[in-house]
Interface confidence: medium
């Protein structure tokens, strides 16, 4: 709390400029007015104020706005904005995309604080959903925003912001969260043709179920090896050797090298060596010749 | 490159005035707050002065408030410590730095190489 | 005026050891702190700004940490050319002020 004192003679400020950085702390609290100041908070961001300056200025400010500040005065808070709290930010009501891109911009280059968390579900919020704009400004600062999402959350985003999504976005995507996204995007890009399909598509493809997988294998589409160690094991299962090979094209070969490891490893443990074998890889671990497979869980079904 | 470039040291009686300076070359002068800092002989730095972009706010430390004065003329990048009743205890190497601006206050991120005043009687 | 304590006042130590230097604010200065580094006869060169930000051209062993009203600035493996005195600045409030230097020398 800042003690109140009179304004010194000659130093009230009649507007915002560089002459107050060097103003104490008593001085900026008495002499600078804060509706002064909120009028002309876009010139905040150009003066080098000090921390210790910006406290007073953020004190005044909240004097003025108990309630939480007007939008005018949120979109020019600069660094300004890195001195509130999650608890200042929810009672704002941010509409406009000019003023979140505005706070983006001041906390660019750094982690996703709780500060900008808050501001982003304030915003999201008050859109009511992730519309393609949004998505656009706000993966552009955060590549990693989405993922950051619960797959409640995600359920929210439009297909036609799916455009707006790049593959380095989804890159810390956890299965769950790929399964609500992969639909949308499968919607989304559902007029391309096939090679502009998948290349559009590729980055989804862990949340994608057999069927598609099955359905891709046909078009030629020489899926590369590190999205194939993406794809959801119990959706690779039931690909036969055949499919895998269409799918992966000549990239078949890198199934050696993955063989211990998930999906290949569960994938070969199905197959019958027999049909590896086709592969030339010397891939091992399928099922020797002579034996059968009961598929428990389809008899299940039937029972 | 970036220069700054102090001048006008020297040794100078008690009581007496100086001027020192200090030329900036390299970067947009009028677009930074200017600094000056001191460093007496085996001691640490010490903050003397600092100017505004334009040269509308100035402030001193408590050492020298009344007795210096720190200016600058933007259209010869030029930067001014004007010393008068110099004491002992003022003498030092004097630097210039430039002042980079960051939301949480200032830092220096380019100094001179210093000028020597010396008083002495 | 905020008064900046640093220790130690000299450390002797050998080429790859890591160095720890502490800088305490006589009060909260929240991050407003930046590390110089000054070799004899030379001018001082901006280390590290608000707290632990990497000045452009500095090399990646050097590093700040704390805020509040404690800090550190480590060197994490000592090269020879990193013998100098090592200075912290606070820009939380004016008038700035300095610590009163850190010498780093060979063992």
């Known amino acids: 709390e800042v003690e109140k004192t009179a304004c010194p003679s000659g130093k009230k400020a009649r507007e915002i400029d560089e002459s107050l950085i060097f103003y104490k702390k008593w001085e900026l609290e008495a002499c600078v007015d804060a509706a002064l100041l909120a009028t002309q908070m876009d010139r905040v961001n150009a003066i080098p104020f000090t921390y210790e300056q910006l406290d007073v200025l953020k004190h005044k400010l909240d004097e003025l706005y108990p309630q939480g500040y007007p939008e005018s005065v949120i979109q020019h808070l600069g660094y300004l904005f890195l001195k509130m709290s999650p608890e200042d930010i929810r009672k704002w009501n941010v509409t406009s995309l000019e003023t979140l891109k505005a706070l983006l911009e001041v906390n660019k280059g750094h982690e996703m604080s709780p500060q900008v968390a808050t501001l982003i579900d304030r915003f999201v919020k008050g859109r009511g959903q992730l519309d393609k704009d949004t998505l656009d400004t706000l993966t552009a600062f955060y590549p990693g925003y989405l993922c950051s999402l619960s797959p409640e959350e995600l359920s929210s985003v439009p297909p036609s912001s799916i455009w707006a999504v790049r593959p380095q976005d989804l890159d810390t995507c956890d299965p769950r969260q790929l399964d609500v996204l992969y639909p949308k995007a499968r919607l989304a890009f559902q007029n391309m043709n096939g090679s502009e399909y998948f290349v559009k598509i590729q980055s989804f493809l862990g949340g994608a179920p057999t069927e598609d997988l099955k359905a891709l294998s046909q078009q030629n589409v020489s899926m590369d090896l590190a999205t194939f160690m993406k794809l959801r094991t119990d959706a690779v299962l039931p690909l036969t050797v055949a499919e895998v090979q269409k799918l992966l094209g000549p990239h078949v070969e890198g199934l050696k090298a993955e063989e211990r490891h998930r999906p290949v490893r569960d994938w070969i443990l199905r197959q019958r060596q027999d049909d590896l074998d086709t592969l030339g890889l010397g891939l091992q671990g399928g099922i020797p010749n002579g034996y059968l497979v009961l598929d428990l869980s389809m008899q299940e079904a039937l029972s | 490159q970036v220069h700054l470039v102090e001048s006008g040291g020297g040794v100078v009686q008690p009581g007496r005035s100086l001027r020192v300076s200090c030329a900036a070359s390299?970067?947009?002068?009028?677009?930074?707050?200017m600094y000056w800092v001191r460093q007496a002989p085996g001691k640490g730095l010490e903050y003397v002065s600092a100017i505004t972009t334009n040269g509308g706010s100035t402030n001193y430390a408590d050492s020298v408030k009344g007795r210096f004065t720190i200016s600058r003329d933007n259209s010869k990048n030029t930067l001014y410590l004007q010393m008068s009743s110099l004491r002992a205890g003022d003498t030092a190497v004097y630097y210039c730095a430039r002042g980079a601006p960051g939301y949480r206050g200032y830092y220096m991120d380019v100094w001179g190489k210093g000028t020597t005043v010396t008083v002495s009687s | 005026d905020i008064q900046l304590t640093q220790s130690p006042s000299s450390l002797s130590a050998s080429v790859g050891d890591r160095v720890t230097i502490t800088c305490r604010a006589s009060q909260s200065i929240s991050s407003s702190l930046n590390w110089y580094q000054q070799k004899p006869g030379k001018a001082p060169k901006l280390l590290i700004y608000a707290a632990s930000s990497l000045q452009s051209g500095v090399p990646s062993r050097f590093s700040g940490s704390g805020s509040g009203t404690d800090f550190t600035l480590t060197i994490s493996s000592l090269q020879p050319e990193d013998f100098a005195t090592y200075s912290c600045?606070?820009?939380?409030?004016?008038?700035?002020?300095f610590g009163g230097g850190t010498k780093v020398e060979i063992k």
């Open positions: 390299g970067f947009t002068f009028s677009g930074y707050a």
């Open positions: 600045q606070q820009s939380y409030s004016t008038p700035l002020t």
